[in-house]
Interface confidence: low
């Protein structure tokens, strides 16, 4: 159905990291434009990205209102220059997206090691609390604000002189690990939400090694 010069969108895909959420689809438009609508299961449809020739739409502003809700989007196709024209069924062609629950599905962004500090045979490693695009009370919330104790970090650490990795876990943003005196260590961290079934882990952070500028050392 539909007009002869429009085709329905397909391959609707959610791309989301730390709640920055974009809906992508195909095809690249030829003589047609798109409008996107988004809704929660129980809510009204809200239109976004009106009559666009893009094949993506940033829906972050909508999903951050309640990241635990489940959202559905749909992409309408209209003939270029004649957006009032509808399909044979009396409405424009459209395609539904898969459902998307930001809290359960947004990808965890690559974490960053903020600092490490050695005191004798102990090293305190601090993970930066990444900012999300969830905004409340005049500020953007951090990953920890949103996920609380659902979010843990895994630390991988090893002596600079060897490749044998050890691991530690924390449900805060700090690790306190034992190290051998006089040895330099390298560190990498990964964000994890163990309770998830998909997108459970982030990519590993960039490696930081002792003896470089990032750390702060107090030999006691």
């Amino acid at each position: 159905s539909g007009t002869t010069n429009t085709v329905a969108a397909y391959n609707l895909t959610w791309k989301s990291t730390n709640f920055k959420t974009i809906l992508e689809w195909e095809p690249k438009p030829v003589n047609q434009v798109y409008t996107v609508q988004i809704s929660t299961k129980s809510g009204d449809w809200k239109s976004k990205c009106f009559y666009t020739t893009d094949t993506e739409c940033d829906l972050t502003d909508e999903i951050v209102k309640d990241v635990k809700q489940t959202y559905l989007a749909r992409v309408f196709s209209y003939p270029a220059g004649n957006v009032e024209s509808t399909g044979s069924a009396g409405e424009p062609l459209y395609e539904n997206s898969p459902e998307f629950t930001p809290y359960l599905e947004t990808n965890l962004g690559q974490p960053t090691i903020q600092s490490f500090e050695q005191v004798g045979t102990k090293v305190n490693v601090t993970v930066e609390d990444e900012r999300t695009l969830v905004r409340r009370n005049n500020t953007f919330l951090s990953l920890r604000d949103v996920f609380g104790k659902d979010l843990i970090y895994t630390l991988y650490y090893w002596k600079s002189s060897s490749s044998g990795k050890k691991t530690a876990k924390t449900n805060t943003n700090e690790f306190l690990i034992d190290v051998d005196k006089g040895e330099n260590y390298c560190f990498s961290v990964q964000a994890v939400i163990p309770s998830r079934t998909v997108n459970r882990k982030s990519t590993d952070s960039p490696v930081e090694c002792m003896g470089q500028e990032k750390g702060e050392f107090r030999e006691i």
């Epitope: 209102k65 609390d129 500020t139 919330l141 951090s142 604000d145």
Partner: antibody, heavy 121, light 106 residues
Framework: EVQLVESGGGLVQPGGSLRLSCAAS????????MSWVRQAPGKGLEWVGF??????????EYAASVKGRFTISRDDSKNSLYLQMNSLKTEDTAVYYC????????????WGQGTLVTVSS | DIQMTQSPSSLSASVGDRVTITCQAS??????LNWYQHKPGKGPKLLIY???TLQTGVPSRFSGSGSGTDFTFTVSNLQPEDIATYYC????????FGQGTKLEIK
Amino acid sequence: EVQLVESGGGLVQPGGSLRLSCAASGFTFTEYHMSWVRQAPGKGLEWVGFIRNRAQGYTTEYAASVKGRFTISRDDSKNSLYLQMNSLKTEDTAVYYCARLTMVVAEFDYWGQGTLVTVSS
Amino acid sequence: DIQMTQSPSSLSASVGDRVTITCQASQDINKYLNWYQHKPGKGPKLLIYYTSTLQTGVPSRFSGSGSGTDFTFTVSNLQPEDIATYYCLQYDNLLTFGQGTKLEIK
């Protein structure tokens, strides 16, 4: 077990000052936003203000009724929250509660038992 | 600051009744409204956030609706343990509680 224990309440004259403390335990204090909420005798809850966590620079926000008179601060090394109250008025008489605040859904998820402040001549 | 007007201030109903509390904001607060239950000697408990989302573990007899400036909280099958004072709280711009509604059982 999360615990919040307020102290420092008492009787003070109008125009006077008082400093309330809240000792926190059972959680990583530095990661949480903390708030003060009060309840005047026979009245409802009133949000006083909050202080954000270390990651958000310990910034503060206040209700219009106390702005410029009250100051919230915290000492993460002591797991303590403070409320400095100056230029007190009779209408500031209330039980003051400290509460842990989860900002994403504005949930006060743990509360202290409260401390009574009476402003009277 | 945003003002929240909650009504009624008190309410008496029978077990099994459906009761409704309303909250009106002095300006548009989108759907950034919570409902808290406060029982004597305990800290207030979050029941509903973002107007209508039930907090984990809260019975489904509690519900909320609205957007913009007008909001409604409903208990559909009143139980004896629901005796409490209920507050709305806006969090669109800072935080403001409503005046509270004391719910009693007849």
